[in-house]
Structures are given as structure tokens and as C-alpha cells.
Interface confidence: medium
């Protein structure tokens, strides 16, 4: 499934974000605009749009460049520059801008209901307008095989500039050099060549204390094809939000400081350093080694499908879930299911631009994974894929066009955390992290944002299952994994994100950070919010009228446990519907290289696998955490 979040058209120019993260290659950008009966804007067209109020905080393709149109200076958007900010080195995946010649010459915020020029295909494409309306259609618009089947869960986004970089202005355009650590797959490559499957395994816990585990995995690129065609609709929300990256690193992540590059970085880096890896799409390079994005994965289809647990479910955001995966990134690819976002409005649709850029919340979880690498998860993609960033990207409203849908905003209120998993460096075994993130709420909801921030609660999950079967097998790990999440307001992490980007190359750097997104509603982040804290609600129940569901959040206190501390906090559906997150048959690749297909049925609410104890296991061993009573 692919979610395309689009903005209003300004003089025909609009921004399109795919799956909540930078996951569009140049070739896909051209195909995407073509599907919208548009073309990549020229610089002149972009300048025209800028002149009538178009600005974002997201890098996107235009003809010949990757830019961010900025009207108002913002330190986290285009390095505080204004004008059409040009990223000089654009070797990665970004969002895209499109130009529709038939659009009104001024601002046009009518809803786009379809991709007029999409061709027949198996992909569920959801167009999310800034007002929150979602239009779904089946089809395909991508033609480049590499866009379609990225094989490596490349961190496409991985590339990012370091915070130290500065942009230089030239000729009225701002040229920003974005250093990319990992070249992302050539946008041109056909054939799926993304190779890695990232699989963050997710552990979901229901509020009832039953732990449900879902190993969500990155879909193997090809298997591939079959996966491509999996209907993601059925997969729904994985309510997972918090993620701990235990990427083998002991350090806790440092906060992510907004940096000039954040616009990109956020997506791009997750900072994982890894050696080389992929968007992860998407998805989405083959190694996890690079800083894979949390879910990135993949890129492209996979991306979207992948991890989206609930991307479309605003509610899910609310539910925080811990994703713990010990997975040798290399091996598992299960990609359990594509969660279909369609069903719900994005919490916030993107236009998270700014906020996106700025990863603020630095609440990091103190998770100490057994391994030594740390990964940074920038929240942005946090939810990957389709999610639309509900928590993450809410654009602060820097973008004039980006206003979040109301539904989304409201939903926000209650999303305490989001997590994301980032694959770790290539062979590191712990790649997922727990990345609690506060959800930005709509401006009006800010208060909600912090909820209970002061109280730090934590749930310590003790894996009951064989440690070796833990989420996605800790191939490298031998001992039991006890995880703790330390989340508390008090944790102030250094927000400096120095190093984050730079560390991309270093597999050991894994910073977990949850960056806060701005409120969706568009306002810039509220300085008052405690960005760093994750919002864990104490027994907070939020009702989502639109879904008629209510979710109970379990208080999480941070419990710090020794070196493995990964805490999983999961707030699940009070109904325990977490299980529904996975469904559908999926082929998963295991480290062994073999693939097996798991069948999950949405109908039973569990995605196959043993359900005892409420734990679902899907393709891939998953550790079942127990929540102490």
C-alpha cells in the first residue's frame, strides 16, 4: 500500500509525500507526478508557487533539483533560509513536488480524489489530502523496477547532512550540500535491487497485559513479487508505536537536534549508522547496515507496506507499542504485513514538514541493547509508511499548505508515543529500538501532548520466551533480553543531534530519539511542550470517535535495567485488538535465506502464529514480553 500525502496546489505546484517519509526516488517522482497528470515543476514554477504562499519543510524533487520552498525562516527547515532552498547533493530519496498545469493560478485546496493517470496494478494507493480526506484506489504508477522492488531496505533516507553542514547561497538559490552517507539506490534502477529486508519485529502489548507480539518485517523485496501484491488493506493497524532500538548499543540515544538538515534528515537518518545501506520505498537498500530508517524500509511498496502498522490508524498512534527486535537484521525479513492505512485518516498528514524537519523530541529511551551499536531513530518516519506521520511529521504549520486534517489532529491528542524501528547496521543484531515519541498534537491539543509526562512509568517486559526466539531472533544475542524503557520526562537527552547524521556510517551509533513532531495543526512546535518526553499516559483512555474505539494506555514507568534494557511499553487496544495488526499471507525470509509463508487471518484478529497468551508470532520468532502485573 502506498499513501500519498498531498498539499494544496499553489499555482499548480504541490507537494507529495509518500508513506510518511522521504521515500521517492527521482524516477518515481517523475512517475508519480505523471500519475497526477502533472510534471515535476521547473524552478520557475516553484518560485511562482513560493511567491503565492507555498512553503514546506520537506525536501522534494523538482526538475533538476531537490528543494524546499521557504517563505519564513525556520532553523529546522532549509537551514533557516528562505526562497527555494536547493539541496546540492541529492543522491537519496525525497518527497516530490509536482506541477499541474491545469490547476488554478492561485492556491487550490480542493481535494484530489485519485491518481488520474495511474495504471492498473495491485497496489492500494491512498491519496491523503491536507484536510484529512482519503481516497483509495488500486493501481500503480511506478515503472522503475528498483522503485518497485527495492531490495535493500535501504535507508534511502539515510543520507543526510550533518548538523555541522551549512548551506551556501548562490544565485539566489540556496544550495545545501547534503552529505549522504549512503547513497541511496539509484533512483533509476529498475529491478528491484534493494536488498535488505528489514524487519523490525514489533512487540505489541495489549493493555490487558497480554503481550501480543507481532513481528513485523520488512517485506522481502521480491518474493517477492508476491509480497508486492499482498493487499495491505487487510493488514491494519499495528498499534505499535514505541520502539526501542536496542541496536546493540549501549548508549542511549541522544536527542535529535533539529538541524538544518532535518528536513531531510529526519527521514533520512534515523541515523543508523551502518555501513552501508536502505527508503525503504520504498521502500526502503539491502543492508540494514546503513542507517536504515525505522521502517524504511523499505522503500516503495515495501515501504509502505511494511511497517505501517496502523499507519492509517490514528488510534494506533495512540497506542504505544514497543517494538523490540532483536533481529539480526540481516536475516529476517519478514515483513509481516502491510498495514493498511486506508482505513483511517492519517493523524496528521504530513505536512509535517517542518516538524518533520525538526526532530525535537529527544526523549530517548534509555535502552540499552546488548549490542553495541546504537541507532538513531528519527522519528519521522516513525511510523513509516503510510502512516503519515502521524506522529511524526506533523508539520508544524510551517507549511502554509500543510494543515492537518482535523480528524488527524484530534486523533493526535491522544497519541502518546510512536515508535519506530530502525534497522541497524548491517549485521547488528539489535536493530529495532524503542523510540518513544511524543505525538505532537494539534495546537489545541498540546496539553494532551504532555500528559503525564511528569510521571514516568515504565513497564518492564521480561521476555518469557526463549530469548533466542525473540523478536526476530537475536541472532547475535545469547542471553535473555530484559528490556526496559526508561522514559521519563526527566530524561533530557541532549538534543544535539550532532553526530547523528554523521554517525550514519558508524554502525555503532544508534541514537534513539524520539523526535517530536510539531503539532499537526500546523503550529510550530510549542516550545512549552516537553519535546523530549514521550507521552505515556497513565491508564489514559482515549476515545476515537471516528473509529468508535477507545484505547487504554498503560502507564509506563521507566525501569532501568541493566544492559539489555529495552523496555517495551505497549499500549494496546484495550480490546486487545492489537492482534489485528497483522494479517495476510506473507512470505518471509529468514536469516537462513529460506522463505516461508505465514498465513494470518485478519478475521480471527490474530495474525497466525501461536496466540497463546495473546502473543502473535508472525513469521519470525518473537519474544513475548510479559508485563508485570
Amino acid at each position: 500500500q502506498i499513501d500519498l500525502n498531498i498539499t494544496c496546489r499553489f499555482a499548480g505546484v504541490f507537494h507529495v509525500e509518500k508513506n510518511g517519509r522521504y521515500s521517492i526516488s527521482r524516477t518515481e517522482a517523475a512517475d508519480l507526478c505523471k500519475a497526477f497528470n502533472s510534471t515535476l515543476p521547473t524552478m520557475a514554477q516553484m518560485e511562482k508557487a513560493l511567491s503565492i504562499g507555498f512553503e514546506t519543510c520537506r525536501y522534494g524533487f523538482i526538475e533538476g533539483h531537490v528543494v524546499i520552498p521557504r517563505i519564513h525562516p525556520n532553523s529546522i527547515c532549509a537551514a533557516n533560509n528562505t526562497g527555494v532552498y536547493i539541496l546540492t547533493s541529492n543522491t537519496s530519496q525525497y518527497d516530490t513536488y509536482c506541477f499541474n498545469a491545469s490547476a488554478p493560478p492561485e492556491e487550490d485546496c480542493t481535494s484530489v480524489t485519485d491518481l488520474p493517470n495511474a495504471f492498473d496494478g495491485p497496489i492500494t494507493i491512498t491519496i491523503v489530502n491536507r484536510d484529512g480526506t482519503r481516497y483509495v484506489q488500486k493501481g500503480e504508477y511506478r515503472t522503475n523496477p528498483e522503485d518497485i522492488y527495492p531490495s535493500n531496505p535501504t535507508d534511502d533516507d539515510v543520507s543526510s547532512g550533518s548538523s555541522s553542514e551549512r548551506s551556501s547561497t548562490s544565485g539566489g538559490y540556496i544550495f545545501y550540500t547534503f552529505s549522504t552517507v549512503h547513497p541511496i539506490p539509484d533512483e533509476d534502477s529498475p529491478w528491484i535491487t534493494d536488498s535488505t529486508d528489514r524487519i523490525p519485529a514489533t512487540t505489541l502489548m495489549s493493555t490487558s497485559a497480554t503481550a501480543t507480539e507481532t513481528a513485523t518485517k520488512r517485506q522481502e523485496t521480491w518474493d517477492w513479487f508476491s509480497w508486492l501484491f499482498l493487499p495491505s488493506e487487510s493488514k491494519n493497524h499495528l498499534h505499535t508505536t514505541t520502539q526501542m532500538a536496542g541496536t546493540s548499543s549501549n548508549t542511549i540515544s541522544a536527542g535529535w537536534e533539529p538541524n538544518e538538515e532535518n528536513e531531510d534528515e529526519r527521514d533520512r537518518h534515523l541515523s543508523f549508522s551502518g555501513s552501508g545501506i536502505d527508503d525503504d520505498e520504498d521502500f526502503i537498500s539491502s543492508t540494514i547496515s546503513t542507517t536504515p530508517r525505522a521502517f524504511d524500509h523499505t522503500k516503495q511498496n515495501q515501504d509502505w507496506t511494511q511497517w505501517n502498522p496502523s499507519h492509517s490508524n490514528p488510534e494506533v498512534l495512540l497506542q504505544t507499542t514497543t517494538r523490540m527486535t532483536d533481529v539480526d537484521r540481516n536475516g529476517t525479513t519478514a515483513y509481516e504485513g502491510n498495514w493498511n492505512p486506508e482505513a483511517h485518516p492519517p493523524l496528521i498528514h504530513h505536512e509535517h514538514h517542518e516538524e518533520e524537519e525538526t526532530p525535537h523530541s529527544t526523549s530517548t529511551i534509555q535502552a540499552t541493547p546488548s549490542s553495541t551499536t546504537e541507532e538513531t531513530a528519527t522519528q519521522k518516519e516513525q511510523w513509516f509508511g503510510n502512516r503519515w506521520h502521524e506522529g511524526y511529521r506533523q508539520t508544524p504549520k510551517e507549511d502554509s499548505h500543510s494543515t492537518t486534517g482535523t480528524a488527524a489532529a484530534s486523533a493526535h491528542t491522544s497519541h502518546p508515543m510512536q515508535g519506530r524501528t530502525t534497522p541497524s547496521p548491517e549485521d547488528s543484531s539489535w536493530t529495532d529500538f524503542f523510540n518513544p515519541i511524543s505525538h505532537p498534537m494539534g495546537r489545541g491539543h498540546q496539553a494532551g501532548r504532555r500528559m503525564d509526562m511528569d510521571s514516568s512509568h515504565s513497564i518492564t517486559l521480561q521476555p518469557t520466551a526463549n530469548p533466542n526466539t525473540g523478536l526476530v531472533e537475536d541472532l547475535d544475542r545469547t542471553g535473555p533480553l530484559s528490556m526496559t524503557t526508561q522514559q521519563s520526562n526527566s530524561q533530557s537527552f541532549s538534543t544535539s543531534h550532532e553526530g547523528l547524521e554523521e554517525d550514519k556510517d558508524h554502525p555503532t551509533t544508534s541514537t534513539l530519539t524520539s523526535s517530536n513532531r510539531n503539532d499537526v495543526t500546523g503550529g510550530r512546535r510549542d516550545p512549552n511542550h516537553s519535546e523530549g518526553s514521550t507521552t505515556l499516559l497513565e491508564g489514559y483512555t482515549s476515545h476515537y470517535p471516528h473509529t468508535k474505539e477507545s484505547r487504554t494506555f498503560i502507564p509506563v514507568t521507566s525501569a532501568k535495567t541493566g544492559s539489555f534494557g529495552v523496555t517495551a511499553v505497549t499500549v494496546g487496544d484495550s480490546n486487545s485488538n492489537v492482534n489485528r495488526s497483522l494479517s495476510g499471507d506473507q512470505d518471509t525470509f529468514h536469516p537462513s535465506g529460506g522463505s516461508h509463508t505465514t498465513h494470518g487471518s485478519e478475521s480471527d484478529g490474530h495474525s497466525h502464529g501461536s496466540q497463546e497468551g495473546g502473543a502473535n508470532t508472525t513469521s519470525g520468532p518473537i519474544r513475548t514480553p510479559q508485563i508485570p502485573e
Epitope: 512517475d31 495504471f119 492498473d120 496494478g121 495491485p122 500503480e140 511506478r142 515503472t143 522503475n144 523496477p145 528498483e146 518497485i148 522492488y149 531490495s151 535493500n152 531496505p153 535501504t154 549512503h182 547513497p183 541511496i184 539506490p185 539509484d186 533509476d188 534502477s189 529498475p190 529491478w191 528491484i192 535491487t193 534493494d194 536488498s195 535488505t196 529486508d197 528489514r198 522481502e220 523485496t221 521480491w222 518474493d223 517477492w224 513479487f225 508476491s226 552501508g276 545501506i277 536502505d278 537498500s285 539491502s286 543492508t287 540494514i288 547496515s289 546503513t290 539480526d328 537484521r329 540481516n330 536475516g331 529476517t332 525479513t333 548491517e426 525470509f589 529468514h590 536469516p591 535465506g593
Partner: antibody
């Protein structure tokens, strides 16, 4: 510039195994899958399988399943394709390929493997 | 698996002429996931077209692809001397990836 350089020609006896290497340069090896395709004399190209260079996962064509093993050494940015139980009909030029449309040489130059008793 | 049949097997033309190569699939190729390659003697194949009609980087615009479903066509509007080679179509919409038998474009 993307470049894939393969190991030299090999002559093997039936029943033996051959391992062909493919060293990648000009891009981040682990970011892209590596495919292996062979072409017997006068025959069409046959896709053998691919490896997710990032995590080592592989996918093989049913035709070669059980006889082919594709691996990679990320530190050396090299992919390997080993074909066992060689038969005379396995005589072909084996190519590693990064199927992509960018510039450069996404295919290796080919390695001729001759299976002869 | 999807079997791709190319025709004609050999096409004899002169430089400057238009070449039309056909590729028929035994079953519909998902989302037009069809590529065309050019291969010259002793060389590895070179990607020309992907997605049925998108030219790969650096490919001259005299090469164009079209078609969908089961019938695809590669057209070389004006043959240049360097265009005489064997052309293969390949589908990458389902596993295993398969190639056509090739069409040899030779100088008449």
C-alpha cells in the same frame, strides 16, 4: 561509476561446483540487491536468483533451487554465486547484475564457466 | 512462470530504418513491468527500457517502448550502426524473472 567486476573464466568437470565472484564498486554495495543471470551459448538469458546484499537473504529461480547458492561479503563489496553438481548444460556465461537504469555498468562483464569432462 | 516470446527472431534492416520488435507474454505482465535490453557480442546486456516505456539513463530517444498486458513493442525509430545487436525483453513483475528469446537486428 557503478561497476561490477567478475572473476575469471572457469573450467569444471561435471559434478563439480563453481563459485563466481562479483566485486561491486561505485555505489554502496549493501544498498542494492545483486542478481545473477546466465546465458548459455546461443540461448536466452536466464535469471538464477538474487541476494539481498544487506541481510543476505536470497531468492532463487526454481530451476536452480538446490544447486545455486548466492552469498555476499559486504566488507569486500562482493557477491558470490556458487553452482554445484555441474552438468554440461551449465556451460554458460554467468553475469552478476544490479538491475537498474542508471548510468554505469550494472552488469558484470560475465564469467564463462565451461563444464566439460 | 511467464514465458516471453519475441518476434521476429531476426530483423534485417538498414541504418536509418525503423525497427519494430515485438515481445509477447504468456500471461499479463504486472503493471507493465517489462524491460528491454540490448546485447552486443561479447558484452553484457544493457538496459534500454523499463516499465514498458521508460528509457533508462543515457538511452537515446530513438529507442521507445510501448505496450501493456501481454503485448509489448520496442521501436528504434532510426537505426544507427551501433544499434545492430540482439534485443531481449524481460519481465520483472513476477518471479522468476524471465527473458524473451531475443531478436537479432542485423544489417541488411
Amino acid at each position: 561509476q557503478v561497476q561490477l567486476v567478475q572473476s575469471g573464466a572457469e573450467v569444471k568437470k561435471p559434478g563439480a561446483s563453481v563459485k563466481v565472484s562479483c566485486k561491486a564498486s561505485g555505489y554502496t554495495f549493501t544498498n542494492y540487491a545483486m542478481h545473477w543471470v546466465r546465458q548459455a551459448p546461443g540461448q536466452r538469458l536466464e535469471w538464477m536468483g538474487w541476494i539481498n546484499t544487506g541481510n543476505g537473504n536470497t531468492k532463487y529461480s526454481q530451476k536452480f533451487q538446490g544447486r545455486v547458492t548466492i552469498t555476499r561479503d559486504t566488507s569486500a563489496s562482493t557477491a558470490y554465486m556458487e553452482l554445484s553438481s555441474l552438468r554440461s548444460e551449465d556451460t554458460a556465461v554467468y553475469y552478476c547484475a544490479r538491475f537498474y537504469s542508471g548510468s554505469g555498468s550494472p552488469w558484470g562483464q560475465g564469467t564463462l564457466v565451461t563444464v566439460s569432462s | 512462470e511467464i514465458v516471453l516470446t519475441q518476434s521476429p527472431g531476426t530483423l534485417s534492416l538498414s541504418p536509418g530504418e525503423r525497427a519494430t520488435l515485438s515481445c509477447r507474454a504468456s500471461q499479463s505482465v504486472s503493471s507493465s513491468y517489462l524491460a528491454w535490453y540490448q546485447q552486443k557480442p561479447g558484452q553484457a546486456p544493457r538496459l534500454l527500457i523499463y516499465g514498458a516505456s521508460s528509457r533508462a539513463t543515457g538511452i537515446p530517444d530513438r529507442f521507445s517502448g510501448s505496450g501493456s498486458g501481454t503485448d509489448f513493442t520496442l521501436t528504434i525509430s532510426r537505426l544507427e550502426p551501433e544499434d545492430f545487436a540482439v534485443y531481449y525483453c524481460q519481465q520483472y513483475g513476477s518471479s522468476p524473472l524471465t527473458f524473451g528469446g531475443g531478436t537479432k537486428v542485423e544489417i541488411k
